[in-house]
Amino acid sequence: ESGYAQNGDLEDAELDDYSFSCYSQLEVNGSQHSLTCAFEDPDVNITNLEFEICGALVEVKCLNFRKLQEIYFIETKKFLLIGKSNICVKVGEKSLTCKKIDLTTIVKPEAPFDLSVVYREGANDFVVTFNTSHLQKKYVKVLMHDVAYRQEKDENKWTHVNLSSTKLTLLQRKLQPAAMYEIKVRSIPDHYFKGFWSEWSPSYYFRTPEINNSSGEMDPI
């Protein structure tokens, strides 16, 4: 019922590896959901290739993805979010590869934001707080967060703390005195919905106080 590709195009196409991965973001723009897919091989020739999703849609049988440079995406309210959809890479009407995917199992939350660290002198600790847009959402409300921090000079020596709230207390005695720290946070679905880690929030930088020689305690900044 649809267009076609030249035979040569199809023969060339069959030589390539068209494996791809996708993630969904629910209520990412008001009530709109998004679905983003990309080829795993960055060198695949994407000329004349399209992505299509069929099934588990509210209003149409199939939808075509929009291509934006190397990624393909759909932004719509029309995902049923019940059952599996069939996502295919197509040349004209020929499907090169397909995957059956439940969009609720490939959810990538939005990155947390407004990360900040406040030092409490009396308690000798640091209160880490951040925000997430998911607190206001209807679907993906419950998240697990991964807070990662490191001393700035330690390139790859991150300490990770998992938590379900948006507040974390770091004890001063667990940190090096008079040191600059970098901290960041990301989120993953943690109830009914499954999927992937969000992007990291922008990093926040803070300095620990020096040790007060007489008391052995750190000075506030």
Epitope: V58, V60, N64, F65, R66, K78
Partner: antibody, heavy 122, light 107 residues
Framework: QVQLVESGGGLVKPGGSLRLSCAVS????????MAWIRQAPGKGLEWVST????????YYPDSVKGRFTISRDNAKNSLYLQMNSLRAEDTAVYYC???????????????WGQGTLVTVSS | EIVMTQSPATLSVSPGERATLSCRTS??????LAWYQQKPGQAPRLLIY???TLHIGIPARFSGSGSGTEFTLTISSLQSEDFAVYYC?????????FGGGTKVEIK
Amino acid sequence: QVQLVESGGGLVKPGGSLRLSCAVSGFTLSDYYMAWIRQAPGKGLEWVSTISASGLRTYYPDSVKGRFTISRDNAKNSLYLQMNSLRAEDTAVYYCARPLSAHYGFNYFDYWGQGTLVTVSS
Amino acid sequence: EIVMTQSPATLSVSPGERATLSCRTSEDIYQGLAWYQQKPGQAPRLLIYSANTLHIGIPARFSGSGSGTEFTLTISSLQSEDFAVYYCQQYYDYPLAFGGGTKVEIK
């Protein structure tokens, strides 16, 4: 503002050919699926063809499949319908139509041209 | 292929009265239905999409309902400019299809 202007209609003998054009303005053609819809005199609406935003995919009902070809030239802001092996029952006003929603393939139409009349008669 | 059936073919209504138009589909199309109004010598005009979403600029006296295979267009209080032919259209799947139309005429 959005405008769609069809041209190329006229009188043609059965078995003949005709090429309809639709010149569009006021929106980015490459963002939209586009369609041709026809209406025989005194009759209802009949969908004729749809082309995807990229132009890579085309769709037809059985009544015109193999005889009609839809195409587009986004650079020229134009949509086309090549009609071959025309029959008396193809006589109709042919409308070019744009969906309300860009990109994905929701085919309900908020902008229509004024139509161009195709008459197939010997 | 999805077959569209509109009823009645003609509806005679007095101005100010309510008009109810029906559209049935041969298969489940969920909410993939649109309604159009057409006046003589003019192109169709989109009224409703997604079965019940009023298109921008369309008066609130028009409303759509239904899902699956049974759909209704209601005009709550007919105005003189509403006398026209109304078509439903399914866009759930190809081939796209229109109903045969309902002519709303002055009683």
